[in-house]
């Protein structure tokens, strides 16, 4: 008799999972030597054992927290860039931008990027029909609450200036339930953060409004300025000419507003 | 078994480009790390840099700045090598080459090269 | 950049003798050294990782040594087909960087 198996509305584990995650892990040594030390296998069976025998929807950081041990990694702390609804501009930045990481720079971050993944309780079993959503089945999911714990940690560690890209062509350019709203604003430290400056990244061609001056960007400024943290916000009308420009800074055209 | 096969032999006039494919098989393509290396005749080896399959991350020797660029198309399975502004002195055989992620990170495979040839 | 100073640049020896490489980096790359053959004509071959760890297929006749600043390879009795120009390579940090060969010819 075939086993009663939990349906979530989410999208079921990515599909070669292990062999991706223990192939990510050992290219990102590959690619920063400064990480060689790490033990892929061992990083793997920390991250399953996160999520493996347990119930999808009663996943804590704690369940994380071998993980975390085992991926711990110095990034220069006034060196972050966080990032809300935009993350390929960020990728693109940080790859021209070399000294500047977002949490996808980063071992755990570059590890679980875009991947879904969830077991069943009391099975061994990875489930590659179905996962719980965040808004429909649950908060407390493998994939939720592993963000969560990275960006929260990620938070945590940065000083001096911190930068935020934010997506100008969304209906809220800050949004208080992304994880930057929901976890990344409320774990900086005050006394080791002196200002968050947001960069609002426009869409359209010919738009040329203030976009720091939006609602929802005052209420970032508010959520801030309430935690000791000073805030400044830049308009990037031109992203293709921002990226452009970062990877040219000598080009002449370069000195005017991007 | 894994293979790399690379594309023929070029001639190119200086301040000419040349791309360079490498066609992968035997191994799921996103999952390493691929390298590029070249030889000038009767040289040694030289290399050029990495590209992350996956994300499309690189990283170049500092001397091929702003002349290399190294793309991959996953569908294909297929990494480019891009150079451009040739000079004489970039007359060599290029080749592609990946780890085997259990031998350290020596390059335990290699394509069969690619000899540029630039002459005016 | 690491530099790695292979010594010599030419070796002359017979079938059956015990040949000895030097591979000298310019800094602590730890273990971090491969070691390739390559004969005319075709891509280099790895023969060590990990500076002592014999790769896939590659004869016990060969063995690797040393970690730090300093490695030799070593072929314990030469056989016709050894003959080829060996490289180190220091992936311990980027630029990798290779060591500028040595041509081991039939005396």
């Known amino acids: 008799v075939p086993r009663w198996r939990q349906q979530w509305s989410g999208p079921g584990t990515t599909k070669r999972f292990p062999e991706t995650v223990l192939a990510r892990c050992v290219k990102y040594t590959e690619i920063h030597p400064e990480m060689r030390h790490v033990d892929c296998q061992s990083v793997w069976d920390a991250f399953k054992g996160a999520f493996i025998s347990k119930h999808p929807c009663n996943i804590t950081e704690e369940d994380y927290q071998p993980l975390m041990k085992l991926g711990t990694q110095t990034v220069p702390c006034n060196k972050i860039l966080l990032w809300s609804r935009i993350k390929d501009l960020a990728h693109q930045f940080t790859q021209v931008q070399r000294d500047m990481f977002t949490l996808e720079d980063t071992l755990l971050g570059y590890l679980a990027d875009d991947l879904t993944w969830c077991g069943e309780f009391n099975t061994s079993k990875i489930n590659y029909q179905s996962c719980p959503d965040w808004r429909k089945d649950c908060s407390n999911n493998p994939v939720s609450v592993f963000w969560k714990t990275v960006s929260r940690r990620f938070a945590e560690a940065a000083c001096d200036v911190v930068h935020v890209m934010l997506n100008g062509s969304r209906s809220k350019i800050f949004d208080k339930n992304s994880t930057f709203g929901s976890v990344e604003v409320h774990n900086l430290q005050p006394e080791k953060v002196q200002t968050l400056e947001a960069w609002v990244i426009h869409g359209g061609r010919e738009d040329s409004r203030d976009l720091c001056q939006d609602p929802t960007i005052k209420e970032l400024e508010s959520i801030i300025s309430k935690r000791n943290i000073q805030f400044s916000c830049k308009n990037i009308y031109r992203p293709d000419k921002f990226l452009q420009c970062v990877k040219n800074p000598e080009d002449s055209s370069c000195t005017s507003e991007i | 078994q894994v293979q790399l096969v690379q594309s023929g032999a070029e001639v190119k006039k200086p301040g000419a480009s040349v791309k360079v494919s490498c066609k992968a098989s035997?191994?799921?393509?996103?999952?390493?790390?691929m390298h590029w290396v070249r030889q000038a005749p009767g040289q040694g080896l030289e290399w050029m840099g990495w590209?992350?399959?996956?994300?499309?991350?690189?990283d170049y020797a500092q001397k091929l700045q702003g002349r290399v660029t190294m793309t991959t198309d996953t569908s294909t399975s297929t990494a480019y090598m891009e150079l451009r502004s040739l000079r004489s002195d970039d007359t060599a055989v290029y080749y592609c080459?990946?780890?085997?992620?259990?031998?350290?990170?020596?390059?335990?495979?290699w394509g069969q090269g690619t000899l540029v040839t630039v002459s005016s | 950049d690491i530099q790695m100073t292979q010594s010599p640049s030419t070796l002359s020896a017979s079938v059956g003798d015990r040949v000895t490489i030097t591979c000298r980096a310019s800094?602590?790359?730890?273990?971090?050294l491969a070691w390739y053959q390559q004969k005319p004509g075709k891509a280099p071959k790895l023969l060590i990782y990990?500076?002592?760890s014999l790769a896939d297929g590659v004869p016990s006749r060969f063995s690797g040594s040393g970690s730090g600043t300093e490695f030799t390879l070593t072929i314990s009795s030469l056989q016709p087909d050894d003959f080829a120009t060996y490289y180190c390579?220091?992936?311990?940090?980027?630029?990798?960087?290779f060591g500028q060969g040595t041509k081991l010819e039939i005396k």
């Open positions: 080459a990946r780890s085997a992620h259990t031998t350290g990170f020596g390059f335990a495979y």
């Open positions: 035997g191994y799921t393509f996103t999952d390493y790390i």
């Open positions: 590209i992350d399959p996956e994300y499309g991350r690189t």
């Open positions: 800094e602590d790359i730890y273990s971090n």
């Open positions: 990990d500076a002592n």
């Open positions: 390579q220091q992936y311990n940090n980027y630029p990798y960087t």
